[in-house]
Amino acid sequence: EVEKTACPSGKKAREIDESLIFYKKWELEACVDAALLATQMDRVNAIPFTYEQLDVLKHKLDELYPQGYPESVIQHLGYLFLKMSPEDIRKWNVTSLETLKALLEVNKGHEMSPQVATLIDRFVKGRGQLDKDTLDTLTAFYPGYLCSLSPEELSSVPPSSIWAVRPQDLDTCDPRQLDVLYPKARLAFQNMNGSEYFVKIQSFLGGAPTEDLKALSQQNVSMDLATFMKLRTDAVLPLTVAEVQKLLGPHVEGLKAEERHRPVRDWILRQRQDDLDTLGLGLQG
């Protein structure tokens, strides 16, 4: 808390400008009206205030908006956003994607902070669902964003938003998350032809059931081993040797290198040795 002192003669700020960087904390407190700060918020980010000075400005804004900042202020916070606590952000109502982008830009290159997580949560809750534009924005800033959501939260993603998802966005997703995303992806890409469909659906196959894998095996898709290893074990086990051979195509030889790892290990143990021998890979059931 800055001590209350009268503003020295001639130092009363009439504009938010560069001259304020030379003000001591107590002078900023005494000489910059909160009302002035509120009207000229867009200038704050263009001025290289110290963290201590930003503390004073934040204190003034907090006092001005006890129920939370309005979006007209939030969109101009810039580096002042880094001073906000999750508790501050929970009071906000952010509806504009441009505001969200502006604040994510401030945090760019850093891990997702509790402040950013709270901001995104407020934004998505305000919108009611993770629409395509929002998902595009969030995954651009945080490729792992989608996989940070719970299955319950992912259920609010409309199928149309799946078009915004890139393979790398799903790298850290676990099977429970893919279980939610796969049916949405299947719905989103249902009108694509075979090869194009497989390219799009491939990243989501960790949530695919057995019958869908069987169907894919009839389409000469040549699934790579990395994708196969991410499939649900319970979905792979019922597949026959012939179906796995068709599913993998020329990549079937890779099974030998993965024979000790799930789901390959468990699948091998379920097959008749005679069938495995037809692959000519020396797999032992």
């Epitope: 009439r14 504009e15 009206d33 909160a34 009302a35 002035l36 509120a38 009207t39 000229q40 867009d42 907090d62 006092e63 001005l64 908006y65 006890p66 129920q67 309005p70 007209s72």
Partner: antibody, heavy 119, light 114 residues
């Protein structure tokens, strides 16, 4: 001395629109939001809306959305309020008021503009 | 919106008497982070515009005589005039500025001089 000088009284017909002005002097016009307040029957005060003279941003009381439009002319340090589709309910005294330095109280008021809507 | 209720709606007192008027809000105007109450008092003399008397519930605006005192916290506030003068004949309004930007005024207390 900080002053807000408002335009004179108006007699207007129902259905018409009109514009009230409020000229600010004695302070930095772009440093303080300008507010408008309605006083009906010489008693009730109602906040209509505010405008940020620096960037033209506005915020309205839900009740007055579509009834009042706030604008500013920075070059002349003047705020305006246009009242649309006037009815007898709009007969009142309208004040412009500058927001206080540290929060949203009103430290300087104009003298008021009396608007009478009558055929 | 926060509803502001003032009482009494009018009162008549003699010069030199003490006056207390009340203002109640439908929700608390106290912000715990700064321990300030977001309430202002205005005086409106006949034929004039309102004039700021008190802000932050108890801070006198410069130039306001010290016979005017604001007090209270949370939802209950009072304006006290310690010794009424004839020039204090006016309507007194309270205003909350806690809920940006939907600020609301009380219905006013009319002070008459006997």
């Amino acid at each position: 001395e900080v002053q807000l000088q408002q335009s004179g009284p108006e007699l207007v017909k129902p259905g018409a629109s009109m514009k009230i002005s409020c000229k600010a002097s004695g302070y930095s016009f772009t440093g303080y939001t300008m507010n408008w307040v309605k006083q009906s029957h010489g008693k009730n005060l109602e906040w209509i809306g505010l405008i940020n003279p620096y960037n033209g941003g506005t915020s309205y009381n839900q009740k007055f959305k579509g009834k009042a439009t706030l604008t500013v002319d920075k070059s002349s340090s003047t705020a305006y309020m246009e009242l649309l589709s006037l009815t007898s309910e709009d007969s009142a005294v309208y004040y412009c008021a500058r927001v206080g330095g540290s929060s949203w109280y009103f430290d300087v008021w104009g003298a008021g503009t009396t608007v009478t809507v009558s055929s | 919106d926060i509803v502001m209720t003032q009482s009494p709606s009018s009162l008549a007192v003699s010069v030199g008497e003490k006056v207390i008027m009340s203002c109640k809000s439908s929700q608390s105007l106290l912000y715990s982070s700064n321990q300030k109450n977001y309430l202002a008092w205005y005086q409106q003399k006949p034929g004039q515009s309102p004039k700021l008397l008190i802000y932050w519930a108890s801070t006198r605006e410069s130039g306001v005589p010290d016979r005017f005192t604001g007090s209270g916290s949370g939802t209950d506030f009072t304006l006290t005039i310690s010794s009424v003068k004839a020039e204090d004949l006016a309507v007194y309004y309270c205003q909350q500025y806690y809920s940006y930007p939907t600020w609301t005024f009380g219905g006013g207390t009319k002070l008459e001089i006997k």
